[in-house]
Amino acid sequence: EEELQVIQPEKSVSVAAGDSATLNCTVSSLIPVGPIQWFRGAGPGRELIYNLKEGHFPRVTAVSDPTKRNNMDFSIRISNITPADAGTYYCVKFRKGSPDVELKSGAGTELSVRAKPS
């Protein structure tokens, strides 16, 4: 059985303040069944950025329809970027369970924010 890969192709992304940022993530397999979540930072304190199942993420949308059968693209778009959004973002695959079990993380994408051009 091929090992699941979580692919974040860009090591870094630079966005002007006020613009939207797209953070790309694909998985190499539909198996095992379970959600993808996005986090900022690593370790115990990491911040939840997007979770399809539940939560309040007014500035974050999925690029593809994550409910679509056979979807393997879990990229997100964050709107109206500010300097406070800078950081390293991780796309993380979980195995469905009670609770869900973390399986694999992408390598991370560092988001930097440029001053808005005048």
């Epitope: 979540q37 115990p44 304190g45 911040e47 939840l48 539940e54 309040h56």
Partner: antibody, heavy 117, light 108 residues
Framework: DVQLVESGGGLVRPGESLRLSCAAS????????VTWVRQAPGEGLEWVSL???????YYADSVKGRFTISRDNSKSTLYLQMNSLRAEDTAVYYC???????????WGLGTLVTVSS | EIVLTQSPGTLSVSPGERATFSCRAS??????LAWYQQKPGQAPRLLIY???TRATGIPARFSGSGSGTEFTLTISSLQSEDFAVYYC??????????FGGGTKVEIK
């Protein structure tokens, strides 16, 4: 405005139990880790326990096996169940919001726990 | 576990003067060091993280420096509201999160 309000402290005897609560408001509670830090009278800060956004729990060695941290996201509330309390657990217990940098950016005012016979 | 040692334990400074105190880590923490201020009867307040980044709303008179195992917090011109206890905390290796023993800044 971010607010964290602890409650549940009080005077208990050694060996007894107590449950602390921390009501959070002003931020999306589900999106952040939260933690407990304590301060014995006249002493410095000691980290006690943390619960991540996914529910993973972490404890200081001094409380492992006696204290249990939990969260109720529907109530935006953090808890600390403290069993088999000892005199050395006497302290002000603070809850704090954890940033993605693993620092504590907002703190409650604390609740005093006194363990004495 | 990373042990943080702060010095001096107490610092006596006159208002308007510069105050500098240090935090030494038992092993390298890179730039992952934070500073907190605590006034009597109050909760701690985050001042600095990543060794030199001021937290939201913290005045420019507070500055942090250092990397590896040696760190410094400087208050360029002490105001009356700055007399307090200051704690360092490493945020690179967890658990446990560890704090230094504190430096008390008192009025000379």
């Amino acid at each position: 405005d971010v607010q964290l309000v602890e409650s549940g402290g009080g005077l208990v005897r050694p060996g007894e139990s107590l449950r602390l609560s921390c009501a959070a408001s002003g931020f999306t509670f589900t999106n952040y880790a939260v933690t407990w830090v304590r301060q014995a009278p006249g002493e410095g800060l000691e980290w006690v326990s943390l619960i991540s956004v996914t529910g993973t729990t972490y404890y200081a060695d001094s409380v492992k096996g006696r204290f249990t941290i939990s969260r109720d996201n529907s109530k935006s509330t953090l808890y600390l169940q403290m069993n088999s309390l000892r005199a050395e657990d006497t302290a002000v217990y603070y809850c704090a919001k954890v940033t993605w940098k693993n620092v504590f950016d907002y703190w409650g005012l604390g609740t005093l726990v006194t363990v004495s016979s | 576990e990373i042990v943080l040692t702060q010095s001096p334990g107490t610092l006596s400074v006159s208002p308007g003067e510069r105050a500098t105190f240090s935090c030494r880590a038992s092993q390298t923490v890179g730039s992952k060091l934070a500073w907190y201020q605590q006034k009597p009867g109050q909760a701690p307040r985050l001042l600095i993280y990543d060794a030199n980044t001021r937290a939201t709303g913290i005045p420019a008179r507070f500055s942090g420096s250092g990397s590896g195992t040696e760190f410094t917090l400087t208050i360029s011109s002490l105001q009356s509201e700055d007399f307090a206890v200051y704690y360092c905390q490493q945020h690179t290796d967890w658990p446990p999160y560890t704090f230094g023993g504190g430096t008390k800044v008192e009025i000379k």
